[in-house]
């Protein structure tokens, strides 16, 4: 069981949408629902997600990256991992950084994954700069 | 299958060279050759690879740290990672950042990956600071 | 054999100490024993933290974050990986910054896995931002 | 609507100090940033620095530096550059302008403040 | 500093004619596949408008007869069919690193 999405442009809204179709997209054995990747099987996981976020103008607004779990029988979301960058980069200068997350997880069957952004004008999609993936243990 | 490369001094070009040797290094059942490793069983990898950049007087020159794969099936090799930073440190100053990429890549024989940089002289090639490796899934 | 453990705010002194019980944690088939963890059989392993280092007002103090290992055959430590950074915020700014680490290493029965940072009082410990885990290949 | 509105014109001896303030309506100030143009009569225009709206920190066109200080303040949407030890040839207009990161340009502009250097 | 250089500075042109407005950077503006080159339209006793960014995207609200093209060091600005109202002064500025840089302008006037 494994997924390997990326980036996906049209993302107007949160949680992120991923390519799951194109290019060099994995999706076996787990499936991907509006932003999601829904866990059929429990066991353990590693999940991880890059996010690429770049500007023109710096104006240092906090940036932040999570990787979430939803499930019904829960009320509340719960932050699996999260990255958070504040001053980290020179005002008005173009910058680029990325934040990276990866580690291992107790999933459990309907479990669904999502990755949140703080800034989402300001995450660039290419496949190989902003990603989301997992694979069974 | 497994391999964990280390820094080598001695880089020259591009791709990075990668110590195969001494050290903290894991080489098995994948090969080593020229920069890159060399797949010998198609299937699903999880690959990695930190680089550990820094200067003595920061000019924030764009730095990238990319993963990339070439099959001598393919005309061009393909881009599977990589990580941008720009305006990252104070002009002037002594400064250090590193780049972290890691992600499920479907690979075939006879594919061959390697890592590449934009500012060879900005890396630093200590074991524990800037590596490559993978793992078979 | 897997573990997952996360910050633990009251952590006073290096290296740091782990959350084992409460929470995302995840502990089995490898022992926590005072900041680290003991591998009990030899073998592949991929191991991985993250620290997630923020301040009120940057003095860019270097920071750095280290995963080492300590076997009682061996008289020195030896740092598996390393994350560094100099000059990553704008000074008298709020600022905040993570540090990311994972690789494969060949462990052996008793090795001890220690995480180490340069300012702790910089770290926050919250569980999604701050983690120390492995599993075996 | 997007609307950046610059303070009145201004008549200041050669030696003293002017502050000219723009401030933003329609839109979320501290998304983006603000930066200074200034433009001598019948000259080109001058960039002169920029300024985040969010962080409050400046970075200055070299030319200007030790004489121009940029500010902000969030709680009234409105930034500030202040420019001393005045001289004649620095009357001119002087306008604001916002950049928004995730863009390539200054998208609005205030509509100016004359500031006239004269004995 | 990157140094723009604007020619010519005035263009005479009759109205209905095209215009071709150029400008040269003292070093390349392209990063990452995307050209920092922008050009603003001024009229007298008004701010500058943005006209064009990153060399070819046309700003929101801004007329189709305008149009942008150019990479690396050679921008051009170009008015197909030229309008009353589009006689004014016309800058490019690029906005590749700080400090920004502007042309000296082009007039552009009624022949």
């Known amino acids: 069981k494994v997924a390997h999405l990326t980036g996906k442009p049209n993302s107007r809204s949160m949680p992120l949408e991923w390519e799951d179709t194109y290019g060099i997209v994995l999706l076996s054995g787990v499936k991907y629902k509006k932003g999601g990747l829904v866990i059929n099987e429990t066991g353990l996981y590693f999940v991880y997600s890059k996010v690429y976020f770049r500007g023109q103008s710096c104006t240092n607004l906090p940036l932040s990256h999570k990787v979430y779990m939803r499930n019904s029988k829960y009320p509340q979301d719960l932050v699996m991992m999260e990255g958070k960058m504040m001053s980290y980069c020179t005002t008005g200068q173009m910058w680029a950084h990325s934040s990276y997350l990866g580690a291992v997880f107790n999933l459990t069957s309907a479990d669904h994954l999502y990755v949140n952004v703080s800034e989402l004008s300001l995450v660039n999609f290419e496949e190989s700069q902003t990603f989301f993936g997992l694979y069974k243990l | 299958k497994v391999a964990h490369l280390t820094g080598k001094p001695n880089s020259r070009s591009m791709p990075l060279e990668w110590e195969d040797t001494y050290g903290i290094v894991l080489l098995s059942g994948v090969k080593y050759k020229k920069g890159g490793l060399v797949i010998n069983e198609t299937g699903l990898y999880f690959v990695y690879s930190k680089v550990y950049f820094r200067g003595q007087s920061c000019t924030n020159l764009p730095l990238s740290h990319k993963v990339y794969m070439r099959n001598s099936k393919y005309p061009q090799d393909l881009v599977m990672m990589e990580g941008k930073m720009m305006s990252y440190c104070t002009t002037g100053q002594m400064w250090a950042h590193s780049s972290y990429l890691g992600a499920v890549f479907n690979l075939t024989s006879a594919d061959h990956l390697y890592v590449n940089v934009s500012e060879l002289s900005l890396v630093n090639f200590e074991e524990s600071q800037t590596f490559f490796g993978l793992y078979k899934l | 054999k897997v573990a997952h453990l996360t910050g633990k705010p009251n952590s006073r002194s290096m290296p740091l100490e782990w959350e084992d019980t409460y929470g995302i944690v995840l502990l089995s088939g490898v022992k926590y024993k005072k900041g680290g963890l003991v591998i009990n059989e030899t073998g592949l392993y991929f191991v991985y933290s993250k620290v997630y280092f923020r301040g009120q007002s940057c003095t860019n103090l270097p920071l750095s974050h280290k995963v080492y290992m300590r076997n009682s055959k061996y008289p020195q430590d030896l740092v598996m990986m390393e994350g560094k950074m100099m000059s990553y915020c704008t000074t008298g700014q709020m600022w905040a910054h993570s540090s990311y680490l994972g690789a494969v290493f060949n462990l052996t029965s008793a090795d001890h896995l220690y995480v180490n940072v340069s300012e702790l009082s910089l770290v926050n410990f919250e569980e999604s931002q701050t983690f120390f885990g492995l599993y075996k290949l | 609507q997007v609307q950046l509105v610059q303070s009145g014109a201004e008549v200041k001896k050669p030696g003293a100090s002017v502050k000219v303030s723009c401030k933003g309506s329609?839109?979320?100030?501290?998304?983006?940033?603000i930066h200074w143009v200034r433009q001598a009569p019948g000259q080109g225009l001058e960039w002169m620095g920029v300024?985040?709206?969010?962080?409050?920190?400046?970075s200055y066109n070299q030319k200007f530096k030790g004489r121009v200080t940029m500010t902000v303040d969030k709680s009234t949407s409105t930034a500030y550059m202040e420019l001393s030890s005045l001289r004649s040839e620095d009357t001119a207009v002087y306008y604001c302008?916002?950049?928004?990161?995730?863009?390539?340009?200054?998208?609005?502009w205030g509509q100016g403040t004359l500031v006239t250097v004269s004995s | 500093e990157i140094v723009m250089t604007q020619s010519p500075a005035t263009l005479s042109v009759s109205p209905g004619e095209r215009a071709t407005l150029s400008c040269k950077a003292s070093?390349?503006?392209?990063?990452?596949?995307?050209?920092?080159m922008n050009w603003y339209q001024q009229k007298p006793g008004q701010a500058p408008r943005l006209l064009i960014y990153?060399?070819?995207n046309l700003e929101s609200g801004i007329p189709a007869r305008f149009s942008g093209s150019g990479s690396g060091t050679e921008f051009t600005l170009t008015i197909s069919s030229l309008q009353s109202e589009d006689f004014a002064v016309y800058y490019c500025?690029?906005?590749?690193?700080?400090?920004?840089?502007f042309g000296q302008g082009t007039k552009l006037e009624i022949k």
């Open positions: 302008a916002r950049f928004p990161d995730w863009d390539y340009a200054m998208d609005y």
């Open positions: 300024i985040s709206t969010y962080q409050g920190d400046a």
């Open positions: 500025q690029h906005s590749r690193e700080l400090p920004y840089t």
């Open positions: 990153a060399a070819s």
């Open positions: 070093q390349s503006v392209d990063y990452d596949g995307d050209s920092y």
């Open positions: 329609g839109y979320t100030f501290t998304d983006y940033t």
